[in-house]
């Protein structure tokens, strides 16, 4: 093994390098010293390092490591952050268009139901947005509410338009009758199934992307231990103490040190792999009734069909409801 | 059938109803994201190697530093000697992950569980139990998808035809990462960038 080159007799090189790290220099010895107080860069002979310099090197080493880690994850972080934002906005656009489609369907096919229908449709799609963003709303409740609200308007405006104003008191009775008589057939249930499946998948997709950001942010801002700081210092800076400014760490040695410093972070690997593969599986299944774009943009048509179903059975329904709600002002409908 | 004229759109610039074959759709964008994410599947296991390759390491030099002394790059001492009589590397590994890392692992386990639960098994996209109560007068078939947009002729086809790039102010090209131009080339697209 070749002998190490003699250390800089004046510590001049070490001083000029250290000055870049810590302007103001009172810590670099003029000439090599025994260095008995050193704890990391343990000297085999005279050294150009002091205890204070060692502390500064440790701090710098840990900072370097943090920067390396942040730059390592920059592309990945950018990818997930930007996609999370894009998908969230895209989903909101889908919801907005689904609402527009549905409102236009009412305006063109059932103008007498507006503006009440617009209000109910608006509330329904607001709930859809809230659900996608993680609010605790039950989809079945949302759909039931839409049909509960629509039926009294459909009944009083389309099926029985001659009702006097005082008969509007029957709205509560009509809400109850809507469910008991299944006036919309199986359409509410159909919509519940389609909407809940597509929205659940959409919501978990967004949640997963946001967690991806959280994972990267967590590992991005890890504070490395003192032990790790000492290892990094020994690898990156202790050679300077011997005046070996241009020497680089051995590759194998670097890998061993990094694996030591990163032991905790690397434990994420297994779950990270699983995360990406599970997300892929989810995405592969996001079509037809599991695709919110497909489901929501087709809702106006299903709602239209459900109203047609009511109209088709209007005669039978009007008779039944007439009997059922005749005395709704005197008694409570249950 | 549900009459739906185009002139009712509030922001037509976003929603193109025309059947454009290669339009960007949400599903294509999702698949594109997954492909990009898969190139980062080994991100965490590759980190130690990545950091070594992006920090000063002896590559072409004959001699290198092993933490204690100058040694020949291919000697046994290149990896080992620097570790002797110093704090125990094994101990460092045995400490286990930091609490924040343990927390994030728990969250990952939870989301992975949810993702697996939500994933649609192949060949079972349609739930047959929907019609347990039966539709009257044949409103929909067994396949509940038939009910989507089942309003007959002239019904606007709305399957995956939103053009989001028109409205979204984002461009997903990763080349546009601020400051990416002065950074190192990614290794195997695994992880990129750093300072020296």
């Amino acid at each position: 093994q070749p002998p190490p080159p003699p250390p800089d007799a004046t510590c001049h090189q070490v001083r000029s390098f250290f000055q870049r790290l810590q302007p103001g220099l009172k810590w670099v010895p003029e000439t090599p010293v025994p260095g008995s107080d050193l704890q990391v860069c343990l000297p085999k002979g005279p050294t150009c390092c002091s205890r204070k310099m060692e502390e500064k090197y440790q701090l710098t080493a840990r900072l370097n490591m943090e920067q390396l880690l942040q730059s390592a994850s920059m592309e990945l972080k950018f990818l997930i952050i930007q996609n999370a934002a894009v998908f969230q906005e895209a989903f909101e656009i889908v919801v907005r268009h689904a609402k527009n489609y549905t409102n236009a369907m009412f305006k063109n096919n059932y103008p007498s139901l507006t503006p009440q229908a617009f209000e109910f449709v608006g509330e329904f799609f607001t709930d859809v947005s809230l659900y996608i963003l993680g609010s605790d709303i039950n989809v079945d409740d949302m759909v039931n509410e839409l049909f509960d609200s629509l039926f009294p308007v459909i009944y009083t405006q389309l099926m029985n338009p001659g009702l006097p104003d005082s008969a509007l008191d029957i709205n509560e009775c009509l809400r109850g009758a809507r469910r008991d008589l299944k006036v919309f057939g199986n359409f509410p249930k159909l919509i519940m199934t389609q909407v809940s499946k597509s929205l659940q998948v959409t919501r978990i997709f967004l949640q997963a992307l946001n967690l991806g950001i959280e994972v990267i942010n967590t590992t991005d801002h890890l504070k490395f231990s003192k032990d790790c700081g000492r290892m990094l210092t020994r690898m990156w800076y202790c050679s300077y103490c011997q005046g070996l400014m241009m020497v680089k760490p051995c590759g194998g040695y670097c890998n061993v040190v990094m694996q030591g410093c990163m032991a905790g972070v690397v434990e994420i690997d297994k779950y990270w792999r699983e995360y990406i593969l599970s997300l892929e599986e989810l995405v592969n299944g996001m079509y037809r009734i599991y695709d919110m774009e497909n489901v929501l943009l087709g809702l106006f048509s299903t709602i239209h069909d459900s109203i047609q179903y009511v109209q088709k059975n209007a005669g039978k329904l009007t008779t039944t409801i007439g009997k059922l709600c005749a005395h709704s002002q005197q008694r409570q409908y249950r | 059938s549900a009459y739906y004229p185009e002139d009712l759109f509030i922001d037509k610039k976003v929603l193109k109803v025309a059947h454009v074959e290669h339009e960007e759709t949400l599903s294509s964008r999702r698949r594109e994201l997954i492909q990009k994410l898969k190139s980062f599947i080994s991100f965490y296991s590759a980190l130690p190697g990545y950091i070594c390759s992006h920090s000063p390491v002896a590559e072409n030099d004959t001699l290198c530093w092993n933490g204690q002394e100058l040694v020949e790059r291919y000697s046994q001492k290149a990896a080992r000697n620097g570790m002797k009589n110093q704090f125990n590397l094994h101990e460092l590994k045995m400490k286990g992950p930091e609490p924040v890392v343990s927390q994030i692992i728990d969250k990952l386990k939870h989301i992975n569980q949810l993702l697996r639960t939500m994933s649609v098994p192949k060949g079972r996209v349609l739930d047959k139990n929907l019609d347990e109560e039966g539709f009257e007068s044949g409103d929909c078939g067994d396949d509940e998808d038939e009910c989507i947009g089942g309003s007959g002729d002239g019904m606007m086809k709305v399957k995956n035809q939103l053009r989001f790039l028109a409205e979204l102010a984002y461009d997903l090209d990763v080349d546009d990462v601020p400051g990416n131009n002065q950074q190192a080339t990614p290794k195997d697209n695994e992880i990129s960038t750093f300072h020296n």
Partner: antibody, heavy 121, light 111 residues
Framework: QVQLQESGGGLVQPGRSLRLSCAAS????????MHWVRQAPGKGLEWVSA????????YYADSVEGRFTISRDNSKNTLYLQMNSLRAEDTAVYYC??????????????WGQGTLVTVSS | QSALTQPPSASGSPGQSVTISCTGT?????????VSWYQQYPGKAPKLLIY???NRPSGVPDRFSGSKSGTSASLAITGLQAEDGADYYC??????????FGGGTKVTVLG
């Protein structure tokens, strides 16, 4: 006519439990979200809890989370609030209120007259 | 969850106008969420005045109007009358769908 009638209030010692009930009439109870709101003497309104029309979703204020439980029986048109581990600061008039929406909280368009709960040793 | 911010008091002479503000955050008033306003007389249950930011339930005089902009909402009472002297509360819900009330504003009709 739409009505809500609370019952079950009274004097109770700290740490003990109490169950409030609210009987609803004049509307389709199973179609609407329901709430409990309280008002301490001389103070403003403080929302306590809500439940969706089906009872599948429940919501609580931070101050009562884990101690109070809201529930409903749609077949009996009745709303309940089970209050455990009561504290002096839970002393208030408790109002039962009907929401104008069914799936979640929005606007409370019908209120009961309130029942007084006093927590004191 | 924190309460919405309202001024503790407001006053005006009969026939004048009074506006009460209600300030929240992006997760309640500023989100998708709607603002409601209530009127309460001493010893009585509150009564809904405005829902969905600006809608009046039937029976509420059109002297009462509501509006919302960003994270703030306001209730305007025009042509103030003696019976308008009461406590007024704004209310919204946060992103977790939990209801949040304002601290209340006492409106005094002078003279």
């Amino acid at each position: 006519q739409v009505q809500l009638q609370e019952s079950g209030g009274g004097l109770v010692q700290p740490g003990r439990s109490l169950r409030l009930s609210c009987a609803a009439s004049g509307f389709t109870f199973s179609s609407y979200a329901m709430h409990w709101v309280r008002q301490a003497p001389g103070k403003g309104l403080e929302w306590v809890s809500a439940i969706s029309s089906s009872g599948r979703s429940t919501y609580y204020a931070d101050s009562v989370e884990g101690r109070f439980t809201i529930s409903r029986d749609n077949s009996k048109n009745t709303l309940y609030l089970q209050m455990n581990s009561l504290r002096a600061e839970d002393t208030a008039v408790y109002y039962c209120a009907k929401d104008r929406r069914g799936s979640h909280a929005d606007a409370l368009n019908v209120w009961g007259q309130g029942t007084l709960v006093t927590v004191s040793s | 969850q924190s309460a919405l911010t309202q001024p503790p008091s407001a006053s005006g002479s009969p026939g004048q106008s009074v506006t009460i503000s209600c300030t929240g955050t992006s997760s309640d008033v500023g989100g998708y969420n709607y603002v409601s306003w209530y009127q309460q007389y001493p010893g009585k249950a509150p009564k809904l005045l405005i829902y969905g930011n600006s809608n009046r339930p039937s029976g509420v005089p059109d002297r009462f109007s509501g509006s919302k902009s960003g994270t703030s909402a306001s209730l305007a009472i025009t042509g103030l009358q003696a019976e308008d002297g009461a406590d007024y509360y704004c209310q919204s819900y946060d992103s977790s769908l939990r209801v949040v009330f304002g601290g209340g504003t006492k409106v005094t009709v002078l003279g």
